[in-house]
């Protein structure tokens, strides 16, 4: 008796966190000897979509012509070969960002601070989320992931940082969401330049392992130091 | 700061199966996507395939018939074979990354590239 | 499959001069495009991503817009320096189909 059948790989191009109305392509690919391809979506029915594959027969595009809230959730593709159904693969995220509109980020008590003292960011929202999302730019995860206990929704939360040091200069957007459906993010804030002034220095933040589903920069996101974040929220490292 | 080396024979005889081999160095092949790109002389550049770090592979469907790209995540390297190869194959050859995504900009292009290598096809 | 037209397929400016440079995909592919720099001799270099961000450490002069099928690549004022071919690349799904370049020149 043959084993069961090799999962197949799942991926999106040109990755898996996708703006509102861009396209992605999910690609899954099985073996030369898959006669079909299947899709699935979390909580919806299944099949989500099949395909035939295309030449020489060991993987299938599945094309998202403009995302939507609806494309965003979790996926898992399967082949079809003479001798039945594969393994299902490991799963793929899609997230959209643009679903909400983008909160207020600011920093406090200025975005000019001294190494070696404190300073919080500020992300805002205008109407009640449980999830917030700090990015340092060009980092290729969230920095922080705060939500909210209970389900309890906020319109704010505070990332404090301290003590800071220059590894905390740069530039930081914000991004809001709700917990129902931690796939759809808010646009981004406006940039928030931290400038870090003087000499004091304190020991670096060392970077965080950052498990990347979209390939990500290289850069690290590096996780502020700092106090109890906003009451009521709990504080997630990415 | 990560830096991309081809390397492998600058001659193939015709008919005979190009191999290169980039690699990787001062960061992880574990993430990305990783290309192969060729520029025949006096020419532009054409997109030969990638390879997701997972090992999913695409190809340029004018080449997909001859091409093979692997991946060996332990020796942090990719590799391109080109098979029955002529004349026309004669090029420099790069290997490239495909950054990723970076919240608030988008998604990167190719921001990592080799320096390049000749393959010469002649008998 | 999708086909990239650039045009021109060569230009000749004055230093100084406000060059552009169009993209044009055959089907849309969002802002998912890059142009690359390629100097005489040299590797190529990406100096924009997605459609219209600067790459770390590219001049403010250059700048790309654009998205769906129609992108363009502006130096605001052309440098010595800026001889090269320009590259556009689309790469929302396999091929990541080139263009096929643009010299750039100086008069």
């Known amino acids: 008796q043959a084993g069961p059948l090799p999962k197949p790989t799942l991926w999106a191009e040109p990755g898996s966190v996708i703006s509102w109305g861009n396209s992605v392509t999910i690609w899954c690919q099985g073996t030369l000897e898959a006669r079909e391809y299947r899709l699935d979506k979390e909580e919806s029915p299944a099949p989500w979509d099949r395909q035939n594959p295309l030449e020489p027969k060991n993987k299938a595009r599945f094309s998202i012509p403009s995302m939507t809230e609806d494309y965003a959730g979790r996926y898992r593709c399967y082949y079809r070969s003479p001798v039945g159904w594969s393994q299902p693969s490991d799963p793929l995220e899609l997230v959209m960002t643009g679903a909400y509109s983008k909160p207020t980020l600011s920093a406090l008590p200025s975005p000019l601070v001294t190494s070696g003292k404190s300073v919080t960011l500020l992300c805002q929202s205008r109407s009640p989320m449980d999830t917030f999302l700090l990015i340092k730019e060009r980092a290729a995860h969230p920095l922080l992931h705060l939500r909210s206990e209970h389900g309890a929704q906020q319109h704010q939360a505070e990332f404090p940082m301290s003590p800071v040091t220059s590894v905390h200069g740069g530039t930081y957007r914000c991004f809001s969401s709700h917990g129902f459906s931690h796939y759809l993010l808010s646009h981004p804030s406006d940039p928030l330049e931290l400038i870090v002034s003087g000499s004091l220095e304190g020991p670096r933040p060392s970077p965080t392992r950052s498990v990347s589903t979209a390939a990500g920069p290289e850069d690290q996101p590096l996780m502020p130091t700092g106090s109890v974040p906003h009451s009521g929220l709990r504080r997630h490292w990415e | 700061q990560v830096q991309l080396q081809e390397s492998g024979p600058g001659l193939v005889k015709p008919s005979e199966t190009l191999s290169l081999t980039c690699t990787v160095s001062?960061?992880?092949?574990?993430?990305?996507?990783w290309s192969w790109i060729r520029q025949p002389p006096g020419k532009g550049l054409e997109w030969i395939g990638y390879?997701?770090?997972?090992?999913?592979?695409n190809y340029n469907p004018s080449l997909k018939s001859r091409v093979t790209i692997s991946v060996d995540t332990s020796k942090n390297q990719f590799s391109l074979k080109l098979s029955s190869v002529t004349a026309a194959d004669t090029a420099v050859y790069y290997c490239?990354?495909?950054?990723?995504?970076?919240?608030?900009?988008?998604?990167?292009?190719?921001?990592?590239w080799g320096q390049g290598t000749t393959v010469t096809v002649s008998s | 499959d999708i086909q990239m037209t650039q045009s021109p397929s060569s230009l000749s400016a004055s230093v100084g001069d406000r060059v552009t440079i169009t993209c044009r995909a055959s089907q849309g592919i969002s802002n998912y495009l890059a142009w690359y720099q390629q100097k005489p001799g040299k590797v190529p270099k990406l100096l924009i991503y997605a459609a219209s961000t600067l790459q770390s450490g590219v001049p403010s002069r250059f700048s790309g817009s654009g998205s769906g099928t129609d992108f363009t690549l502006t130096i605001s004022s052309l440098q010595p320096e800026d001889v090269a071919t320009y590259y556009c690349q689309k790469y929302n799904s396999a091929p990541w189909t080139f263009g096929q370049g643009t010299k750039l020149e100086i008069k």
């Open positions: 490239a990354r495909r950054g990723g995504y970076s919240y608030g900009y988008g998604y990167y292009g190719m921001d990592v």
């Open positions: 390879i997701y770090y997972s090992g999913s592979t």
């Open positions: 001062g960061g992880s092949i574990s993430s990305y996507f």
